[in-house]
Interface confidence: low
């Protein structure tokens, strides 16, 4: 996260870290006790399968206090139409091998009906973007959970205030952008998978996942997040299934 | 809201309570009524949520601790009366006035959901968890808010 | 009731150390909220130093950064300041104060010591 | 970082008299502002939270309203006691920055 601030211990508690062979490999969003929202990019390159580990209740990565729980990755699931390498369907299900237990550190996300999360939360302006990546472009990662308010574009604002880059992969109805085009704030690398939280009347709720960008807080471009909306009746279906033998499982989409 | 207040026993209340704090227990020897002592308590200790005329729509307003209730006249609804119970009441609109989820029907008024481990309440727009850890909510915060002693 | 106390010298001289500590009663420096330091020059406005939140993290103003750090003393319910190769430009009102932070932002004051002047001057 | 600009600078005003007083931000804060007061040899009070809350204890003559980048402290009916100095408080972006302030002194 560039130009955000510390996340409060405790105040993130859905938010996931995903460890690969230990180390830090990309956020996530709690959504149930079993299930957690990724990004589908994170898995790209992923060997070992049976070595991902998901965290929650972290805090800082350089100390543990006692309210972090770890949980093996027992599924990864891929919409079928996400291409590794591209930006596209950059979605991913996750089920836990154990359930979680909740605590105070320790919370889902509200994964929101379709037509609630299209016609209301999608105009709420601000959200917020969490993750322990990058606090500046090529820079460091964080070892405290950071956060940012975000502002939320039309598709159609975002292309007219983007400065064109020849080879910028398409924006498409999958995704929405969100940020400041002037360099000063943006989710950065590391924090992929992590949730784009909207609060809506007192409640929060999973709006998108960081997905993309053109570095990070670069001058005229924003950061790009899948739109979770797209997806929710496809992330229901599959959470209400019989498990499935294999890891990594591609599953057809819509 | 508490006018009556100002009248009873002026002379102990401004010596106990406004010019120095004073405890429930020092107020009920002021009030010699629990009832009353508790209206002024709910007031005195957190300031009266009142204050601010929450309530729309010609809805009268109750202080509470840290809180407040609405009773709002027959055409309206929500929390601070804000809702109006008519023809504009569908879910495009103000997401129908919904603290979640909407649904329309033809024919008839639209009706509000909750998420699971939330239940309706009985203005029929509010949620109210049903279980210790429901989603979407930070408890340390909850917590926090919940127990906060307000300054004065 | 929450209650702040500022102590600390009244005089530094200029290259050296500012010190200051805040004492609060009535309420636990751990349980929650931003405990801030903000200054006063003489005739002036106010500008934030920096705070240290409950949990320890803290966040110091850009301009001060490098000369300011703030911490806490959970034992005896107190946080300290300390403002490095302090100049006369540092001579001010200091005052500690506690801020209840929402989630996002917001950092709206509701406590207040009552402030410690501290003049810089050889 | 976010200045806040507030005006007037001093305004002269008499008891019973409204006061409005301004402060605009140089960029967008949403509704991210809050007010204090200030008298002589005190620290500062806070008043308004949040553009338009008021603080537990505040009296209802004073007022918040705007959002973005103007706001006003409005005080309905000026009393003695109001007279002092008031500023504004970014509350929205790091670090969290305050107006110059504006001067209510007795006409």
């Known amino acids: 996260i560039v130009g955000g601030k510390v996340c409060p211990k405790g105040e993130c508690p859905w938010q996931v870290l995903l460890l690969v062979n230990g180390a830090q490999l990309c956020g996530g969003t709690l959504i149930n006790t079993i299930w957690v929202v990724s990004a589908a990019h994170c898995f790209d390159k992923i060997k070992n399968w049976r070595n991902l580990i998901a965290v929650l209740g972290e805090h800082d990565l350089s100390e543990h206090d006692g309210d972090e729980q770890s949980r093996r990755v027992a599924q990864v699931i891929i919409p079928s139409t996400y291409v590794p390498g591209t930006t596209n369907h950059d979605i991913a299900l996750l089920r836990l091998h154990q359930p979680v237990v909740l605590t105070d550190h320790v919370v889902p996300l509200c994964l929101p009906e379709r037509t609630f999360s299209e016609r209301t939360l999608a105009f709420v302006r601000f959200s917020l973007v969490s993750g322990w990546g990058q606090l500046l472009d090529r820079g460091a990662t964080a070892l405290e959970l950071m956060v940012l308010n975000v502002p939320r574009l039309m598709t159609q604002d975002c292309l007219q205030q983007s400065r064109k880059v020849g080879d910028s992969p398409n924006i498409t109805e999958y995704m929405f952008c969100a940020g400041y085009s002037d360099g000063s704030k943006d989710s950065c690398k590391g924090d992929s998978g992590g949730p784009h939280a909207t609060h809506y009347r007192g409640t929060w709720y999973l709006t998108g996942i960081v997905s993309w960008g053109q570095g990070c807080a670069t001058v005229g471009h924003f950061g790009v997040y899948t739109r979770v909306s797209q997806y929710i009746e496809w992330l229901q279906k599959l959470m209400r299934s019989e498990p499935r033998p294999g890891v990594l499982l591609r599953a057809p989409f819509p | 809201a508490n006018a009556f207040l100002e009248e009873l026993r002026p002379g102990s209340l401004e010596r106990e309570c406004k010019e120095e704090q004073c405890s429930f227990e020092e107020a009920r020897e002021i009030f010699k009524d629990a009832e009353r002592t508790k209206l002024f308590w709910i007031s005195y200790s957190d300031g009266d949520q009142c204050a601010s005329s929450p309530c729309q729509n010609g809805g009268s307003c109750k202080d509470q601790l840290q809180s407040y209730i609405c009773f709002c006249l027959p055409a309206f609804e929500g929390r601070n009366c804000e809702t109006h119970k008519d023809d504009q009441l569908i879910c495009v609109n103000e997401n129908g006035g919904c603290e979640q989820y909407c649904s329309d029907h033809t024919g008839t008024k639209r009706s509000c959901r909750c998420h699971e481990g939330y239940s309706l309440l009985a203005d029929g727009v509010s949620c109210t968890p049903t279980v210790e850890y429901p989603c979407g909510k930070i408890p340390i915060l909850e917590k926090r808010n919940a127990s906060k002693p307000q300054g004065r | 009731q929450v209650q702040l106390q500022e102590s600390g010298p009244g005089l530094v001289k200029p290259s050296q150390t500012l010190s200051l500590t805040c004492t609060v009663s009535g309420y636990s420096i751990s349980s929650d909220s931003a405990w801030s330091w903000i200054r006063q020059p003489p005739g002036k406005g106010l500008e934030w130093i920096g705070y240290i939140y409950y949990s320890g993290s803290t966040n110091y103003n850009p301009s001060l950064k490098s000369r300011v750090t703030i911490s806490v003393d959970t034992s005896k319910n107190q946080f300290s300041l300390k403002l490095s190769s302090v100049t006369a430009a540092d001579t001010a009102v200091y005052y500690c104060?506690?801020?209840?932070?929402?989630?996002?932002?917001?950092?709206?004051?509701?406590?207040w010591g009552q402030g410690t002047s501290v003049t810089v001057s050889s | 970082e976010i200045v806040l600009t507030q005006s007037p600078a001093t305004l002269s005003l008499s008891p019973g008299e409204r006061a409005t007083l301004s402060c605009r931000a140089s960029q967008g804060i949403s509704d991210y502002l809050h007010w204090y007061q200030q008298k002589p040899g005190e620290a500062p009070r806070l008043l308004i939270k949040y553009t338009s809350q008021p603080a537990t204890g505040i009296p209802a003559r004073f007022s918040g309203s705007g959002s973005g980048t103007d706001f006003t402290l409005t005080i309905s009916s000026l009393e003695p006691e109001d007279f002092g100095v008031y500023y504004c408080q970014n509350g929205h972006s790091f670090p969290l920055t305050f107006g110059a302030g504006t001067k209510l002194e007795l006409k």
């Open positions: 104060a506690r801020s209840v932070n929402y989630y996002g932002n917001s950092f709206a004051v509701g406590y």
